[in-house]
């Protein structure tokens, strides 16, 4: 038997993936647990095996189809259950009626590249991955630049309040190594959260031109 409080949190990537984390305070012996997804309007159902990510939390990804296929809509509700094996039967440990488009977390932006770099500025572009057509242009981005001698946590956040897949970084120091990250969030959904940060893009500004003798 399992005692203690349980937390079951899931996010939809807007296409064909629901990622879930289940936390359980009480001790679980070597028990096999899984998440089961049962949509209210669709023919498919899906299961994934919960794997430990810490002493008291487990995670898994429900793969609903090909990465870019649209498997759920704004009208769908998915019953999500955590099931743990207890002897010969499965016990329901947690359950939620999951509204996918109220609980969005997109994939991290990809394909970051330097479009143009100068001494004091750098133009960077990126792409969004596996994002639903439902959003049209209703997305926002946050970006941050890592300067020498600083941490990511210290980097100021730059907010782009529209679907703009590029940025021009200004007031940079010449001949300096920087790193850049970006994340994305749909405007839709009560419990929607930011995507993970993209992989960092490293770039170096151009050296300042040498001053001429007078």
């Amino acid at each position: 038997a399992v005692n203690g409080t349980s937390q079951f949190t899931c996010f939809y990537n807007s296409r064909a993936n629901i990622s879930c984390v289940w936390s359980q305070d009480g001790a679980l012996q070597d028990t096999s647990c899984q998440v089961h997804a049962w949509p209210d309007r669709r023919r498919w159902n899906q299961t994934c095996e919960l794997l430990p990510v810490s002493q008291a939390s487990w995670a898994c990804n429900l793969i609903l189809g090909a990465p870019d296929s649209q498997k759920l809509t704004t009208v769908d509700i998915v019953t999500l259950r955590v099931l743990c094996r207890e002897g010969v039967r499965w016990r329901v440990m947690a359950i939620q009626d999951f509204k996918p488009f109220e609980n969005l977390r997109l994939m991290a932006p990809i394909s970051l590249q330097v479009v143009h770099v100068e001494t004091h500025r750098c133009n960077i572009s990126w792409e969004i991955s596996q994002a639903s057509h439902y959003f049209e242009r209703h997305l926002e981005f946050e970006a941050r630049t890592l300067s020498p001698g600083h941490t990511w946590e210290e980097a100021p956040l730059l907010t782009l309040k529209q679907k703009q897949e590029w940025i021009c970084l200004e007031t940079l120091t010449p001949d300096t190594q920087y790193e850049f990250q970006v994340r994305v969030k749909p405007l839709q959904g009560e419990f929607t959260t930011w995507s993970p940060w993209s992989q960092p893009l490293a770039f170096r500004t151009k050296p300042a031109a040498l001053g001429k003798d007078t």
Epitope: D40, R41, R42, R43, S69, Q70, T73, T74, V75, H133
Partner: antibody, heavy 116, light 107 residues
Framework: QVQLVQSGAEVKKPGASVKVSCKAS????????ISWVRQAPGQGLEWMGD????????NYNEKLQGRVTMTVDTSTSTAYMELRSLRSDDTAVYYC?????????WGQGTLVTVSS | DIQMTQSPSSLSASVGDRVTITCQAS??????LNWYQQKPGKTLKLLIY???GLHTGVPSRFSGSGSGTDFTFTISSLQPEDIATYYC?????????FGQGTKLEIK
């Protein structure tokens, strides 16, 4: 096997109400949405709304301007559709259908005639 | 509301012919498109769900394809019992909407 059996034909006067029933069998009634669709004589199909028997949640087509109410009786596995303030252009065959990635099973239809 | 435009509205074909009906949505509906058959005086039958899924018991001569806004329904070899009206329907968003129908006749 899955079956949806609807109530018989009705003749109503303008301004009256009609309540059509749809009795389900052969599956777990509370696990699938039931939609109501109508078809005027010689015309196309219009989705009226749907209801989830497990919770009673409903969605209605705004074009029906609050004249429609969908209910269920889980004890008899029956869905109901009531349409109020009937007009002559409400004359149609009314269908219930189970939703499961499309409307996979349909009732036989109920003809509602609105005539003075 | 999403408008569904079906074409042609009617067509005549011979037994054994390949028959194609198209359906266009007024906005992107991904693959949330279904096809139905209605014979005169009868109720509707689901043939194809989610663009290309063949419903249980439906003969394999029926197929569907497409994505986004443009969809196609095909009968690979027309049989006499296929005489009916065919409808497309989107279940991408409420209110669900249907095409106006394609009436299929035998030459």
């Amino acid at each position: 096997q899955v079956q949806l059996v609807q109530s018989g034909a009705e003749v109503k006067k303008p301004g009256a109400s009609v309540k059509v029933s749809c009795k389900a069998s052969g599956y777990t009634f509370t696990s699938h949405w039931i939609s109501w669709v109508r078809q005027a004589p010689g015309q196309g199909l219009e989705w009226m709304g749907d209801i989830y028997p497990g919770s009673g949640n409903t969605n209605y087509n705004e074009k029906l301007q609050g004249r429609v109410t969908m209910t269920v009786d889980t004890s008899t596995s029956t869905a109901y559709m009531e349409l109020r303030s009937l007009r002559s252009d409400d004359t149609a065959v009314y269908y219930c259908a189970r939703e499961r990635g499309g409307f996979d099973y349909w009732g036989q239809g109920t003809l509602v005639t609105v005539s003075s | 509301d999403i408008q569904m435009t079906q074409s042609p509205s009617s067509l005549s074909a011979s037994v054994g012919d390949r028959v194609t009906i198209t359906c266009q949505a007024s906005q992107d509906i991904s693959n949330f498109l279904n096809w139905y058959q209605q014979k005169p005086g009868k109720t509707l039958k689901l043939l194809i769900y989610y663009t290309s899924g063949l419903h249980t018991g439906v003969p394999s001569r029926f197929s569907g394809s497409g994505s986004g806004t443009d969809f196609t329904f095909t009968i690979s070899s027309l049989q006499p019992e296929d005489i009916a009206t065919y409808y497309c329907q989107q279940d991408n968003n409420h209110p669900y909407t249907f095409g106006q129908g394609t009436k299929l006749e035998i030459k």
